[in-house]
Interface confidence: low
Amino acid sequence: FYDIETLKVIDEEWQRTQCSPRETCVEVASELGKSTNTFFKPPCVNVFRCGGCCNEESLICMNTSTSYISKQLFEISVPLTSVPELVPVKVANHTGCKCLPTAPRHPYS
Amino acid sequence: FYDIETLKVIDEEWQRTQCSPRETCVEVASELGKSTNTFFKPPCVNVFRCGGCCNEESLICMNTSTSYISKQLFEISVPLTSVPELVPVKVANHTGCKCLPTAPRHPYS
């Protein structure tokens, strides 16, 4: 048998695993699709992105609302031509998430 | 130009993005490679897994030490033949991480 305390622990864990905005490490260059001779330092920033579990396999955790936050980063050109400069970089930050059906696939795709 | 306070903020953020064990949502069934007629409730658990950024593209964030933690979950068989039972499930929990070189690829792979 299982007691109420055990069920509470399981339920709390389940709540924590569910689809919600989570702090995630994002690589700036791939996020912005920058040219290969420009890179950023630090290469990664922390933003909130939708993640976690959905109750059904047919659903995926997707963002329903997004804000853009500005991060100060060094933009460096290769070969190094000037003192690295601080530039504001706008990165998507998920503010709302929902378990939504995966996009229907074409039967022949 | 940039002042020291700005650099401190960037430095703090960089520390937080670096390769380290992070609380992650893991799908138990795929983790355990269970047969399709057995599933767990909740389907996901929170464990620590290596994640974050490495300074160089040639390095990836990998686990250097692992412990196994026990999670109490309901194991359900389909079709439902008995009352769902609470079972202890051992899930890998990364306790140490390091930026390590990616495995060398075969030239023809």
């Epitope: 420009t38 330092k41 050109s77 003192v83 | 130009f1 960037i10």
Partner: antibody, heavy 117, light 112 residues
Framework: QVTLKESGPALVKPTQTLTLTCTFS??????????VGWIRQPPGKALEWLAN???????YYNPVLQDRLTISKDTSKNQVVLTMTNMDPVDTATYYC?????????WGQGTLVTVSS | DIVMTQTPLSLPVTPGEPASISCRSS???????????LHWYLQKPGQSPQLLIY???NRFSGVPDRFSGSGSGTDFTLKISRVEAEDVGVYFC?????????FGGGTKVEIK
Amino acid sequence: QVTLKESGPALVKPTQTLTLTCTFSGFSLSTYGMGVGWIRQPPGKALEWLANIWWNDDKYYNPVLQDRLTISKDTSKNQVVLTMTNMDPVDTATYYCVQVTNPFVFWGQGTLVTVSS
Amino acid sequence: DIVMTQTPLSLPVTPGEPASISCRSSQSLVHINGNTYLHWYLQKPGQSPQLLIYKVSNRFSGVPDRFSGSGSGTDFTLKISRVEAEDVGVYFCSQSTHVPWTFGGGTKVEIK
């Protein structure tokens, strides 16, 4: 508040190696993006950038002088050291330590190095 | 290397009168990121250089508004609208667009 102070010999002989130390406070060279560099100024002449070192130990040298220069850091002591080999009387100058930002905001007071036999 | 040429070499001025210093670079100082890294420093007698203007026209904090910078590409100007006695010293232009970072030869401003 940021301060930088240069120290080293006031007089060196031709062909000798000059070693200059920059001791700084108000910032740490372990902080992301931070750099410290050296600039010199011969008496009555223009400024010349020599070298700099970054928080991650990347180093950049003026190509004209790079064969003679070595820059290093001791983060725990808040110090940066510049060595310049094979000194010549034309290297007589005031040597400045700077915090490397774009542009240079914080400079040391400078130390005059005379090269003479 | 980028050569920075300043004119005039010496500039005798009368307090209250305007003054202008020119700086010309041997090639464009426009960086691939669109910024122009041309800066102006003042070195007062017996002191280290101090930043006046950064990126062509931005006054550094605490710099009086009688100082202004302008220009683009290869031609740049520092203007002092009304010279004061405390403005004497050597003015240097500097570029940090291209490595090695280089400085102009300096313009000595002195009171007539």
